[in-house]
Amino acid sequence: ESALITQQDLAPQQRAAPQQKRSSPSEGLCPPGHHISEDGRDCISCKYGQDYSTHWNDLLFCLRCTRCDSGEVELSPCTTTRNTVCQCEEGTFREEDSPEMCRKCRTGCPRGMVKVGDCTPWSDIECVHKESGTKHSGEVPAVEETVTSSPGTPASPCSLSG
């Protein structure tokens, strides 16, 4: 679950930056891809590839884009309205209990076991005992968040809460 957004998650805008488009709030809210100015009079655009906002909002700052870690691939780039989608590289996975890095999937099952589940970005291969059918590794939960590396932002399986 994402933590409360803190100052470092927000991307302060330079008010004087000429490339930032301004418009007026509609009923006190600014459209996706913008945040509201401190005086509440203007909507200031987020910076493409740097920060974003997803909804009509009265945020004083746009949210900072997630950067994919090494070992992750970028499935979808950060835009002014959507955060980055990152995912563990093929052949690696990220577990709930070790979310800090993508780990290599096993190449095969131990002797006496058979593979019943492939390597995915969220789980190692799944092996069961040939006779009993009992699992060697824990089951993946039914629903999880898109994972993003930064709090308050979903990212890909590796870093989104999808």
Epitope: S2, D9, P32, T79, R82, V85, P154, L160, G162
Partner: antibody, heavy 120, light 107 residues
Framework: QVQLQESGPGLVKPSQTLSLTCTVS??????????WSWIRQHPGKGLEWIGY???????YYNPSLKSRVTISVDTSKNQFSLKLSSVTAADTAVYYC????????????WGQGILVTVSS | DIQMTQSPSSLSASVGDRVTITCRAS??????LGWFQQKPGKAPKRLIY???SLQRGVPSRFSGSGSGTEFTLTISSLQPEDFTTYFC?????????FGQGTKVEIK
């Protein structure tokens, strides 16, 4: 794991106000970046997005329902609520609450829904 | 509003079959589209986000593709638990809108 649960009366009389509450467990409604929505599904039909609210209290509504809808939030109870005024039989539907994921990729968690019938 | 046209509205298939469901948008969405599974009396469950990214914990037999105005959900090999309803959601522009749903039934 985040869970959402809708509650409220299952029967509302025409012209009255429909009131529903969504209780969030397994996570804070104030956690940054998430917006909290109401959606409804008329019997045998598709889904309709009603509106959302942020923990700060700022809300945005579907223009088709805006004149009748109010969504509010109570962070101390980890709840958000829907009020729909001047209801008619056409407002009979299953009402869902849902959470938008914080990266802008749509709803990641939903409640199981509550059927509200408008009838005298 | 963006109109989402989902097809087919229903289909009959057998366990092991490959199934494809389509959503067409009345205007371009980039990749701002999700796919959901809805079982009777249960909370809808997200399968795919960002048009093609698989939700954590969702079996890899589910996949999504497309961008712009045409999107597909594919189930590569239907399992008994997959016989239910699926719908798409566009979240490119407000108000967000949904496909009408596709009911996957046992042949």
């Amino acid at each position: 794991q985040v869970q959402l649960q809708e509650s409220g009366p299952g029967l509302v009389k025409p012209s009255q106000t429909l009131s529903l509450t969504c209780t969030v467990s397994g996570g804070s409604i104030s956690s940054g970046g998430h917006y909290w929505s109401w959606i409804r599904q008329h019997p045998g039909k598709g889904l309709e997005w009603i509106g959302y609210i942020y923990y700060s209290g700022s809300a945005y509504y579907n223009p088709s329902l805006k004149s009748r809808v109010t969504i509010s939030v109570d962070t101390s109870k980890n709840q958000f609520s829907l009020k729909l005024s001047s209801v008619t039989a056409a407002d009979t539907a299953v009402y869902y609450c849902a959470r938008d994921d914080s990266s802008g990729w749509g709803f990641d968690y939903w409640g199981q829904g509550i059927l509200v019938t408008v009838s005298s | 509003d963006i109109q989402m046209t989902q097809s087919p509205s229903s289909l009959s298939a057998s366990v092991g079959d490959r199934v494809t469901i389509t959503c067409r948008a009345s205007q371009g969405l980039r990749n701002d589209l999700g796919w959901f599974q809805q079982k009777p009396g249960k909370a809808p469950k997200r399968l795919i986000y960002a048009a093609s990214s698989l939700q954590r914990g969702v079996p890899s037999r589910f996949s999504g593709s497309g961008s712009g105005t045409e999107f597909t959900l594919t189930i590569s090999s239907l399992q008994p638990e997959d016989f239910t309803t699926y719908f798409c959601l566009q979240h490119n522009s407000f108000p967000w809108t949904f496909g009408q749903g596709t009911k996957v039934e046992i042949k």
